[in-house]
């Protein structure tokens, strides 16, 4: 069964910067990745970035830079302009559309006790939505 993992980390050097890392574990080729916050894409979440393996990336504030890390994983840098750091309590979700498996999505957040620079452990918790 394909699986999606999500890691959220706070940058050690800049407490207002966060990075979301997501990856797809499974066969098939990825056709699209959607990163959202506040919940799953299409279920209360708001799109932060869309990454296509050949067409490029599109992103919306507070996303700063979306990029592919490998052929099956991506990262999204976020810039928190607010002083109270709302990202700390936010859920980030990554949805991978792959062929022929369909869509797989997982969510994760920064652990409450996170020290700057430490990442959350992988949180597959797949929301089983094989669209």
């Amino acid at each position: 069964t394909p699986e999606v993992w999500v890691q959220v980390q706070m940058e050690a050097t800049e407490l207002s910067s966060f990075t979301v890392h997501c990856g797809f574990l499974g066969p098939g080729s990825i056709s699209l990745v959607t990163v959202s916050w506040g919940g799953p894409d299409g279920a209360g979440g708001t799109k932060l970035a869309v990454l296509h393996p050949e067409l490029g990336t599109r992103q919306w504030a507070p996303a700063r830079q979306a990029r592919w890390e490998t052929q099956s994983s991506i990262s999204l840098a976020l810039e928190d302009s607010g002083a109270s750091s709302p990202f700390a309590n936010t859920t980030f979700c990554c949805k991978f559309a792959s062929f022929p498996e369909g869509s797989w999505e997982s969510c994760g957040s920064l652990p409450p006790s996170s020290d700057p620079g430490l990442s959350a452990p992988p949180t597959p918790v797949p929301i089983l939505r094989a669209d």
Partner: antibody
Framework: QVQLVQSGAEVKKPGASVKVSCKAS????????IEWVRQAPGQGLEWMGV????????NYAQKFQGRVTMTRDTSISTAYMELSRLRSDDTAVYYC???????WGQGTTVTVSS | EIVMTQSPPTLSLSPGERVTLSCRSS????????????LSWYQQKPGQAPRLLIY???TRETGIPARFSGSGSGTDFTLTISSLQPEDFAVYYC?????????FGGGTKLEIK
Amino acid sequence: QVQLVQSGAEVKKPGASVKVSCKASGYTFINNFIEWVRQAPGQGLEWMGVINPGSGDANYAQKFQGRVTMTRDTSISTAYMELSRLRSDDTAVYYCASHWLAYWGQGTTVTVSS
Amino acid sequence: EIVMTQSPPTLSLSPGERVTLSCRSSQSLLSSGNQKNYLSWYQQKPGQAPRLLIYGASTRETGIPARFSGSGSGTDFTLTISSLQPEDFAVYYCQNGHFYPYTFGGGTKLEIK
């Protein structure tokens, strides 16, 4: 099939604002972002920005920041691009496009002239 | 922002000829993570909207004839039309899909000799 139908030609005076509409059909409107590209007479293409119809969030090219506003009305599957403080060099054909610029509207000619 | 430079600005050719259009970007459009180049090519005819031909530097959009092919990596890209048809005479644009804002080249106009 995917279709993007834009509003008609506009003639505006310098300093005024223009709002161009782009009605989408043939796909789920909130699932695909819409981009705006313009083309001055005899010139090349210029990317203006992109809106996520699901949330209404937009990302604008720096050049247009502060003058452009991209919005949408999900109830009628329509995206809008408003450009304010118009100048003569804003005279152009304005296009909306979806699906990573695979589908384009027919274009809206905006003429800015005193 | 990324500057996309196309050359030559105009080309005069005859139907049946092979043509290669050039596009150069001021920064690499290669995504090191997945080894893909985010470069697209568009065709535009007078009075019409642009049409997507090639994306990912070399992938043909659905319905685009096989005579159109794209190649290149990093900062240098080419669009090749193997045998020009009368309907291919148009303006061709390349576009950076990697860095915001997603800039276009100035275009190359193909005209009939």
